[in-house]
Amino acid sequence: TRDIREPPALKYGIVLDAGSSHTSMFIYKWPADKENDTGIVGQHSSCDVPGGGISSYADNPSGAGQSLVGCLEQALRDVPKERHAGTPLYLGATAGMRLLNLTNPEASTSVLTAVTHTLTQYPFDFRGARILSGQEEGVFGWVTANYLLENFIKYGWVGRWFRPRKGTLGAMDLGGASTQITFETTSPAEDRASEVQLRLYGQHYRVYTHSFLCYGRDQVLQRLLASALQTHSFHPCWPRGFSTHVLLGDVYQSPCTVAQRPQTFNSSARVSLSGSSDPHLCRDLVSGLFSFSSCPFSRCSFNGVFQPPVAGNFIAFSAFFYTVNFLRTSMGLPVATLQQLEAAAVNVCNQTWAQLQARVPGQQAHLADYCAGAMFVQQLLSRGYGFDERAFGGVIFQKKAADTAVGWALGYMLNLTNLIPADPPGLRKGTDFS
């Protein structure tokens, strides 16, 4: 007889990413004997929860919990039964719930209580449902990207761990209700709230991070709509030939549109608004989202927020990727430089509704928002964060790395399950030939 080598035992972890517009479930797996290696945890499977985000269940909290059932049932099938009890399960909510918590804390608590009730019905090791801070969302996204790209440590041929020469990658996340920028910096932050010190695999990282609430793609679109209603009888970012009827209550119910909300308005009034395909007026409308008038620090990004100069390469994911991918793939436009990105945005904004529909057959109303989305991404990167042509050359637009979705979820799980040691692993296990 001879020994049969069994495949290494796998461990699993589950994270529910409760975003503002929808919830996604990610199941991760890793070999139990290699927990401290970098880049060893990968995505096993995923599931998109049908319907809206959990914050949309403010008036029906139990519905928030119920909405997760389909994906949780999938998790029961995707994770081997004997691993259920040892599989940590987390739910993290982001800016949609941060907004709900600002406007209706009781509803926010009720929604979290309802999802907790549902999650505890499953045989996994449930470890809590909570709202992440913007800082956590940014940092965990940065950790995810650099972990997957193996930027923290490398395994040497001599069996020792060593720090690679390549630096870390900055991370830019454009969600539905907020956007985050996070990157390693050498100089101490002038604003302590935007600095995070991390110790990973024995290395020290000083990281700048900031989250801009109400600067997620969906909230930006809503704010632009509110501005268009306020200043124009048309929407310059919508295509000519696109007309919609807007219920004023829908536009002004978000805390992000408070600034544009009229003193008195009839929330049940329906207003007709048409697009005008005007890239220049659209650019002006988008520019109005950013304030550069005052900066209490030596330098700022926008709205008086401290930011050191962008340094190194960046990965831009989520709606950054989807917006740029639409320009590249659906519209066939080059976006390799900032100048090309601006030209692509202008190109989309010049299209009429009929031209857009002919150019991207099959899709429907979602097409109307790509002009504003592209213009916002271009403005945010160039004027907001201060990327020049050289720095922009180091930005990659990508939604996955190593077959795993880039976002805060993996970094969150790695942190909470202690899968990234603060100190470097010791010598490689094995036979000593000396």
Epitope: G52, S56, H245, D250, T352, G362, Q364
Partner: antibody
């Protein structure tokens, strides 16, 4: 209140062109809305044919695209359907309808839902020799 | 194009009872958390009338006994307590993808 009324011949010979007109009252067809034609085969469901927009843009169902023309006469506040090379399979009740994109908010995300909320009473067209 | 299949083809319900009509899409009619599904009611000899948009939003003027639910590919129109005047044919319609398409219809008969 917007009202729509279809008119046109009830009998068309095979291979000929079916022509229908929809007269809109209570609203200018150039002010907004998408002006649709929809048909319903006997005992069957509804089939969207296409529209002409307030801005005079057309959008047609790909299955009928090479036979359909939707045009408008703004002076009469009317829009028309022409369907060429008809066969017995084009026998149906033809409706005109006003549609638009309704902005709706869900989960902090706005979106646009295409709805057809004003309809004519329908006119029956039979294709037969 | 997206094909919508309704069931049952005919539904017979007594006044006061609950009526449930199903609509299944050949592909998801959701996009970024929104369901692009509408429901229409057509009474004999009349034009269709919009009841529900975006899967679950009641059109103004429509009685609260009508409700819609579902997402992705599976949608339901429910009449909580059927009234005699609800006798009609009900159609689902998707607007996620061009061209807009309708289901084959469900005829609701009142016993």
């Amino acid at each position: 209140q917007i009202q729509l009324q279809e008119s046109g011949p009830g009998l068309v010979k095979p291979s000929q062109t079916l022509s229908l007109t929809c007269t809109v009252s209570g609203y200018s067809i150039t002010s907004g809305y998408y002006w649709n034609w929809i048909r319903q085969h006997p005992g069957k469901g509804l089939e969207w044919i296409g529209y002409i927009s307030y801005d005079a843009d057309n959008n047609y169902n790909p299955s009928l695209k090479n036979r359909v023309t939707i045009s408008r006469d703004t002076s009469k506040n009317q829009f028309s359907l022409k369907l060429s090379s008809v066969t017995a399979a084009d026998t149906a009740v033809y409706y005109c309808a006003g549609g638009y994109y309704r902005y709706g908010l869900g989960s902090y995300r706005g979106s646009y839902y295409y709805v057809m909320d004003y309809w004519g009473q329908g006119t029956t067209v039979t294709v037969s020799s | 194009e997206t094909v919508l299949t309704q069931s049952p083809a005919t539904l017979s319900v007594s006044p006061g009872e609950r009526a449930t009509i199903s609509c299944k899409a050949s592909q998801s009619v959701d996009y970024e958390g929104h369901s692009y599904m509408n429901w229409y009611q057509q009474k004999p000899g009349q034009a269709p009338r919009l009841l529900i948009y975006a899967a679950s939003n009641l059109e103004s003027g429509i009685p609260a006994r009508f409700s819609g639910s579902g997402s992705g590919t599976d949608f339901t129109l429910t009449i909580s307590s059927v009234e005699p005047e609800d006798a009609a044919t009900y159609y689902c319609q998707q607007s996620n993808e061009d061209p807009p398409t309708f289901g084959g219809g469900t005829k609701l008969e009142i016993k």
